[in-house]
Interface confidence: low
């Protein structure tokens, strides 16, 4: 002629210690657990009815506490890990292309005392900008009148005509772009006269890359004479400091 222990709930707990059995008509009260709050008008009690079962509480009257709404950052997005602002959840921040995040990428909805609060301040998305790329001696770059460059903006360098008989060579990347760290993708190139010496080889001969003069990136290929072998590389390139790389090879018996 009695009910067993009352039902348990995820979000509620009994206000009194449960007993092994209860008389018909006896009532138990529930309170919201820590981190949950009462959502009227649902009941928070249950009664042992004459069928020796507990009068059901149709819906849990307690709901998880939630952190305050955080809007998308300007030029970015705030993404909830599972669609609700309740405690235990995470809010992920990402910035649009061309912007970078200042602050923490993830905020956590945490319980502080009995309140649900975010673990920190929301970050901000700051525009990625590069200062104008360096000016170079004996050359110029496109968009030289622009003062601020945005993410992925590119400039191209070119060398001026040389005053003397030898042309300026462009050393480095001719096109550089504004990267996501507000720096240019490469150092500015250099414009200078690069001229390597005539590549003399004993007991061998040049077979490709012939020229009157050997400027930057000129490539020369050698072949050994019969009965000799090459010490070093048979292919050399004129590098930016006007020397051959690797050095001109030797031929030995």
């Amino acid at each position: 002629d009695a009910c067993g222990p009352p039902p348990t709930f995820e979000a509620m707990e009994l206000t009194s210690k449960p007993k092994p059995y209860y008389k018909v008509g006896e009532q138990v009260e529930y309170d919201c657990k820590k981190g949950y709050h009462h959502f009227a008008p649902f009941l928070t009690h249950s009664i042992c009815d004459r069928n020796h079962t507990w009068l059901p509480i149709s819906d849990e009257p307690c709901v998880k506490k939630v952190c305050h709404y955080i809007p998308n950052p300007l030029h970015g997005e705030a993404i909830l890990a599972n669609g609700s602002y309740s405690f235990g959840n995470q809010l992920h921040f990402i910035c649009n292309d061309g912007y970078y995040l200042i602050g923490k990428e993830i905020l956590y909805c945490e319980l502080k005392g009995s309140d649900a609060v975010w673990s920190g301040r929301p970050p901000i998305c700051q525009k990625i900008v590069c200062k104008p790329p360096p000016k170079i001696n004996n050359g110029k770059h496109t968009f030289s009148d622009v003062e601020v460059f945005e993410y992925l903006d590119a400039v191209t360098y070119s060398c001026d005509p040389a005053p003397g008989p030898d042309p300026f060579s462009l050393i480095g990347e001719s096109t550089i772009y504004c990267r996501d760290n507000s720096l240019w993708s490469d150092d500015a190139p250099e414009c200078k006269v690069v001229k390597c010496r005539f590549p003399v080889i004993e007991n061998g001969k040049q077979i490709a890359g012939f020229g009157k003069k050997f400027y930057y990136k000129a490539t020369v290929i050698f072949e050994r004479d019969k009965g000799f072998h090459i010490i070093g590389s048979d292919t050399i390139v004129c590098n930016s400091n006007s020397t051959w790389d690797p050095p001109v090879p030797k031929c030995a018996k």
């Epitope: 200042i102 602050g103 923490k104 920190g120 301040r121 970050p123 760290n181």
Partner: antibody, heavy 122, light 107 residues
């Protein structure tokens, strides 16, 4: 209590190198962005380097880029500044600095060490 | 780079006075401005971040205001321990830069 103790300063010739260290205590070092800020003999403050909590993001001003390297050892609670190709204009008091309490990484230089003096002179 | 200018390099005031220290930026910095205090012994403290937010442990007699390019730090009811040099700093754009400082002395 947040404590930042710098060491490694001294007299060095132009073109020389020096490595500064900062021993951090009183907080979870690996949770915070860290910075080096220097003060010139004329009392001007200059930001020198930034490193993110995990060491992924590193920033420098142009004045030291390519010459200075900031790094950290989260296991040892240490911050470092490797300085090379030193110039007379690098002469300064170098401060190790931690960001603010509020679980952010804004450049709010909240906690400063007592500094270590670097003198670059022939 | 954004230049930060503190036009007054030194300032004399009497105890109990209200003191205002100014700082201007070479371009708008959207309130991304901090104030620091450096005592004569070299110790540096953050006073105010984001133009007007008081850092923890800083007395409420300190306040900050401003917008665009012009910012100020106000100290109400000047006390002996406020004798120091005060620096502004912008974090609107890399590289982060400081003003030249304003040295506050007692008359």
């Amino acid at each position: 209590e947040v404590q930042l103790v710098e060491s490694g300063g001294g007299l060095v010739k132009p073109g020389g190198s020096l490595k500064l260290s900062c021993a951090a205590s009183g907080f979870t070092f690996s949770d915070y962005y860290m910075y080096w800020v220097r003060q010139t003999p004329e009392k001007r403050l200059e930001w020198v380097a930034t490193i993110s909590d995990g060491g992924t993001y590193i920033y420098y001003p142009d004045s030291v880029k390519g010459r200075f390297t900031i790094s950290r050892d989260n296991a040892k609670n240490n911050l470092y500044l490797q300085m090379s190709s030193l110039k007379s204009e690098d002469t300064a008091m170098y401060y190790c600095v931690r960001d603010i309490d509020y679980d952010t990484s804004y450049p709010w230089f909240a906690y400063w060490g007592q500094g270590t003096l670097v003198t670059v002179s022939a | 780079d954004i230049q930060m200018t503190q036009t007054t390099s030194s300032l004399s005031a009497s105890l109990g006075d209200r003191v205002t220290i100014s700082c201007s930026a070479s371009q708008g910095i959207s309130n991304y401005l901090n104030w620091y205090q450096q005592k004569p012994d070299g110790t540096v403290k953050l006073l105010i971040y984001y133009t007007s937010s008081l850092h923890s442990g800083v007395p409420s007699r300190f306040s900050g205001s401003g917008s665009g390019t012009d910012y100020s730090l106000t100290i109400n009811n000047l006390e002996p321990e406020d004798i120091a040099t005060y620096y502004c700093q912008q974090y609107s754009k890399l590289p982060w830069t400081f003003g030249g400082g304003t040295k506050l002395e007692i008359k």
